[in-house]
Amino acid sequence: IFPLAFFIYVPMNEQIVIGRLDEDIILPSSFERGSEVVIHWKYQDSYKVHSYYKGSDHLESQDPRYANRTSLFYNEIQNGNASLFFRRVSLLDEGIYTCYVGTAIQVITNKVVLKVGVFLTPVMKYEKRNTNSFLICSVLSVYPRPIITWKMDNTPISENNMEETGSLDSFSINSPLNITGSNSSYECTIENSLLKQTWTGRWTMKDGLHKMQSEHVSLSCQPVNDYFSPNQDFKVTWSRMKSGTFSVLAYYLSSSQNTIINESRFSWNKELINQSDFSMNLMDLNLSDSGEYLCNISSDEYTLLTIHTVHVEPSQETASHN
C-alpha cells in the first residue's frame, strides 16, 4: 500500500498526433500503474471527450460531438495505458487534448496536439479549350494548403496559377498550365507537408505518327521508374480524344489484373503488361482514328500521362477510288 499523501509531480508531456480526415486515430497516454484509475480526456480544456472511473465509462457529460466516437483500451488500463481510440476524425477535431489520469498514488496530465490532414488523390488532366491545350493539376480536397510546383523538362517553372476554393473544412485546388504548341515534358508536384505526402503528375508528348488507312499502330506507354512501383495499386487507361472529349478505349486494374476493352480493334499484350509495359495496338485503322491518344497510369502517388498524335491518311487504293 502506498501512502496517499505521496504526490508525484509529473511535467506536462506534449505529443503531436497527425490524423487523416475520416480515419481513426489513437491519442496516446500512459501512466504508472496504480489502483483506482480515473481517466478524463478533454478537448481545449473545456469539452469532455471521455471519462472513465470506478471501472467503467461515464459518458453522461460527454460533449455530443464525441458521441460513439471514442473508447479506451479497456484491457490495457491496468497496464498503464490510457490512450484514446478516436473514430472518424474531422478537421473540427484539430486542437489540444488533455488526458488526466489519476490513481491512488499519483495524478498526471498529458497533452496531445491533434492535427488533421486531407489529401484526396489529385489528378492531372489534359484539356483542349478551343485552340489551346492545357494541363491541369487538381486536388478536390486538401488540407492544409498544399505546395504546388511545375517543371518543364525538369526545370522549375515560376508561372503557377492556382484556382482555390475553400470549403468549411478543406481546400479544392486547380493549377492549370497552358502548354499550347509545346513538345516538352511537364511535371506537377502537389505536396501536403502535414501528411508528408507528395503526388506527382507527369505529362509526355510523343512524336506524331503517320499511318495509312487499314494499317495498325503501336503506341508505347511505359512508366517512368522514378515514380512507378509495381507493388502499389494502379490503373492504366487508354483513351482517344474526339471533338474535345476523351472516350475510353480500354483500362487495366493492377489490383485485380483485370483488363476491360471497349474497342474491338484495340489489343494489349498480356506478357508486356506483366513487365509493366502498357503499350497498345490499334488494328485496321480508319480515317476517323486520327487524333490524340492518351495513356494514363495512375496510383495514389502519381499520374503519368503519355500522349500520342496519330494521323491516319487514306491508302493509295482509297485515294485512287476517289
Partner: antibody
Framework: QVQLVESGGGVVQPGRSLRLSCAAS????????MHWVRQVPGKGLEWVAV????????DYADSVKGRFTISRDNSKNTLYLQMNSLRVEDTAVYYC?????????????WGQGTLVTVSS | DIQMTQSPSSLSASVGDRVTITCRAS??????LAWYQQKPGKVPKLLIY???TLQSGVPSRFSGSGSGTDFTLTISSLQPEDVATYYC?????????FGPGTKVDIK
C-alpha cells in the same frame, strides 16, 4: 505535506449569506477534487458538496441544493463555498477536504474546520 | 438517495477486546466504502477505503470487509487510543453520504 486552511466562518443571521474559503498547499490543487463536509458540534458528519479537479462537475447534498454553491480558483489554490439563505440548521463546523483523485472518491485529507453559527 | 445506517450507535468494550461495527447501505454500492475515525476534538482521519484496504500508517488491528450492502469494521484488540467515533461513507456516486457514526469507549 497537504495543508487545508478554512476561513470565513462566523455568526450570521438566518436568511443572510456567508462565503467560506479554503487555502490549499502541499499538493497540486488543480489535479484534485475537493469536498465540503460539515459537523454540528457533538453530532455526526454530513457531506455537503464536491467539485471536480477542473470545476466541470459539482454535486450537493439535498439539504443545501439551490442555496449553496461550491467553486474553486485553481490559479489561487483556493476552494470556496458560497452559502445563501442560511438557516439555523446550517450551524456547524465546515471542513474543507481533499478527494483521493478527481472528485469522485473519498476524502483523504481534512482541514481543521471553520465554525458557522446561524442565529437571530 | 442511498441511506447509510450504522450499528451499534455506541459501544463500550475492554482493552484487548475484539470490536465489530456494522455499516449497511440501502442499495448496493459495490466496495465503494470508506471508514473514518474521529477522536474527541480532532478532525476525522481515513482508516480504510475500498471497503477493506488499510490506509497507510493505520495500525493493522483495524480491518474492513464486505461488499454490496453490508460492511464491517473490526478492531481485533481494542486499545485506549481507539476511543473515538467511527463513520462509514459511501462513495460509489454523489451524494457521498456518511453513516450516523458509532461511538466507541473503554469500559
Amino acid at each position: 505535506q497537504v495543508q487545508l486552511v478554512e476561513s470565513g466562518g462566523g455568526v450570521v443571521q438566518p436568511g443572510r449569506s456567508l462565503r467560506l474559503s479554503c487555502a490549499a498547499s502541499g499538493f497540486t490543487f488543480s489535479n484534485y477534487g475537493m469536498h465540503w463536509v460539515r459537523q454540528v458540534p457533538g453530532k455526526g458528519l454530513e457531506w455537503v458538496a464536491v467539485i471536480w479537479y477542473d470545476g466541470s462537475e459539482k454535486d450537493y447534498a439535498d439539504s443545501v441544493k439551490g442555496r449553496f454553491t461550491i467553486s474553486r480558483d485553481n490559479s489561487k489554490n483556493t476552494l470556496y463555498l458560497q452559502m445563501n439563505s442560511l438557516r439555523v440548521e446550517d450551524t456547524a463546523v465546515y471542513y474543507c477536504a481533499k478527494d483521493l483523485i478527481s472528485g469522485i472518491y473519498y476524502v483523504d485529507h481534512w482541514g481543521q474546520g471553520t465554525l458557522v453559527t446561524v442565529s437571530s | 438517495d442511498i441511506q447509510m445506517t450504522q450499528s451499534p450507535s455506541s459501544l463500550s468494550a475492554s482493552v484487548g477486546d475484539r470490536v465489530t461495527i456494522t455499516c449497511r447501505a440501502s442499495q448496493g454500492i459495490s466496495n465503494y466504502l470508506a471508514w473514518y475515525q474521529q477522536k474527541p476534538g480532532k478532525v476525522p482521519k481515513l482508516l480504510i477505503y475500498a471497503a477493506s484496504t488499510l490506509q497507510s500508517g493505520v495500525p493493522s488491528r483495524f480491518s474492513g470487509s464486505g461488499s454490496g450492502t453490508d460492511f464491517t469494521l473490526t478492531i481485533s484488540s481494542l486499545q485506549p487510543e481507539d476511543v473515538a467515533t467511527y463513520y462509514c461513507q459511501k462513495y460509489n456516486a454523489a451524494p457521498f453520504t456518511f453513516g450516523p457514526g458509532t461511538k466507541v469507549d473503554i469500559k
